[in-house]
């Protein structure tokens, strides 16, 4: 027989008191956790559940994206009576169980953050023995991952007429501000910033026409830090190409 | 291409017995519970059987209980229903369904075979 | 066993209406229901899950609410693709059920 409750509120981490000895399904999440790219992050996923010595077979599960339908990047599973959730899966060996479900707690740890990971994670835990349930995060917590600027592409492309154009594209978060600086540009000179669509923190600036020859910086820069990379454009007059 | 593909349908008489077989494509059919979902000619949907993601637990239908039997091969990305002791009242296309969300349990059903026939009559 | 039943059974409408779609459990099912629309000749498709979760790549006039034992289908503005027939299914507890169905019908 399974039975399931899903509460229609989801309460904020810490926030939750109950009176009644018959305790409700909840779960309580933080709305955000920040880290920086690199380090390691604690996501805190805490619950309640009306089956006051169940201590039956139980799974932990976090999924990242959004709830019942995202994939998992967390899976572990507790035998009848025992306290250690062994790992059935944890995506690129980055996650690691820090609470004990046992103790109502399925706090993860994620290790070697990348700005991939910024998005949305949903606790869920299901019982599987003589008591039948589940219960899983609607709302999740939202890992904001920052990182300081790093330019990943800087290169120098054709034009119509013979011309020729530079792009720079870096990532970090927040979004960096790109500016060019080169010959005939003066002392920098700022681009339009234009987040990718799908790619919310990688940011190009694009150089329309490069009239003179010589070296072309890209900067970014973001609250975190900088990061600079240079291209050099150097045309065999007469000819079309050019060498960079 | 994520798919479902029956197979196995087919007419046989009072009593007698099939073997459904459900492939699966195009995700990773271990992390998933599979159910059998059939439809009587003209009429609702009716739920038969589910079975977890690692195969260990297998639920029933009244109706089916003690006659069908649901199983997997996560290996061969397969999911079966034998079928025994065959009724008139079994007549009906068999649909197989993936679970939403890779867990144990059928929060909804996300993806549906394009069903196969069963008819049971003499 | 949960019984489910949908209301209307069937339902004569117009491109671009607004229609609803009813369904009660027999007894409190939390959030734990779904929708689906069948045509003629085909499988079931998702819709909704969990109440009022929007599957992936289904159109946005497509909504759905409710929690306990009183749950609808709300499709906002009827394109003529939407006449099917559309079933609820309870995912509380086993054996899991399903209405059934309302039939969508071009008026």
């Known amino acids: 027989f399974v039975r399931t409750k899903i509460d229609t509120t989801e309460n904020l981490l810490n926030t939750e008191v109950h009176s009644s000895p018959a305790q409700r399904w909840s779960m309580q999440v933080p709305p955000e956790v920040s880290a920086e790219a690199g380090d390691a992050a604690v996501l805190p996923c805490t619950f309640t559940h009306p089956h006051r010595h169940y201590d039956g077979p139980l799974t932990a599960i976090w999924r990242a994206g959004e709830p019942y339908a995202g994939p998992q990047v967390f899976r572990c599973a507790a035998a009848r009576g025992s306290e250690l959730c062994q790992t059935a899966l944890s995506l690129h060996g980055r996650f690691r169980l820090l609470g004990n479900p046992r103790r109502n707690d399925l706090s993860l740890r994620v290790e070697r953050l990348a700005l991939a990971d910024d998005r949305r994670y949903f606790c869920r835990v299901e019982f599987a023995g003589d008591v039948h349930d589940r219960y899983e995060s609607r709302h999740g917590v939202r890992l904001h991952v920052t990182a300081a600027p790093r330019i990943v592409n800087i290169s120098v492309l054709p034009s119509p007429a013979h011309a020729f154009r530079a792009l720079c594209t870096a990532e970090g978060e927040p979004p960096p501000a790109l500016a060019w600086s080169g010959p005939a540009l003066g002392n920098s000179l700022a681009a339009v910033r234009s987040p990718r669509e799908g790619h919310g923190h990688l940011v190009t600036a694009e150089l329309p026409a490069l009239t003179h020859d010589g070296r072309y910086t890209c900067t970014a820069a973001n609250s975190l830090g900088r990061s600079e990379a240079s291209v050099y454009l150097f045309r065999f007059h007469g000819a079309s190409g050019a060498s960079t | 291409e994520v798919q479902l593909l029956e197979s196995g349908g087919g007419l046989v008489q009072p009593g007698g017995s099939l073997r459904l077989s459900c492939a699966a494509s195009g995700f990773t059919f271990s992390s998933y519970a599979m159910s059998w979902v059939r439809q009587a000619p003209g009429k609702g949907l009716e739920w038969v059987s589910t079975?977890?993601?690692?195969?260990?637990?297998?639920y029933y239908a009244d109706s089916v209980k003690g006659r069908f039997t649901i199983s997997r091969d996560n290996s061969k990305n397969t999911l079966y229903l034998q079928m025994n002791s065959l009724r008139a009242e079994d007549t009906a296309v068999y649909y197989c369904?993936?679970?939403?969300?890779?867990?144990?349990?059928?929060?909804?059903?996300?993806?549906w075979g394009q069903g196969t026939m069963v008819t049971v009559s003499s | 066993d949960i019984q489910m039943t949908q209301s209307p059974s069937s339902v004569s409408a117009s491109v671009g209406d607004r229609v609803t779609i009813t369904c009660r459990a027999s007894?409190?099912?939390?959030?734990?229901l779904a929708w689906y629309q069948q045509k003629p000749g085909k499988a079931p498709k998702l819709l909704i899950y969990?109440?009022?979760s929007l599957q992936s790549g289904v159109p946005s006039r497509f909504s759905g609410s409710g929690s306990g034992t009183d749950f609808t289908l709300t499709i906002s503005s009827l394109q003529p693709e939407d006449f099917a027939t559309y079933y609820c299914q309870q995912s509380y507890s086993i054996p899991y059920t399903f209405g059934q169905g309302t039939k969508l019908e071009i008026k």
């Open positions: 079975i977890w993601g690692g195969g260990g637990s297998t």
């Open positions: 369904a993936k679970a939403i969300g890779s867990s144990w349990y059928s929060d909804a059903f996300d993806l």
């Open positions: 969990v109440a009022s």
């Open positions: 007894q409190d099912i939390s959030s734990w």
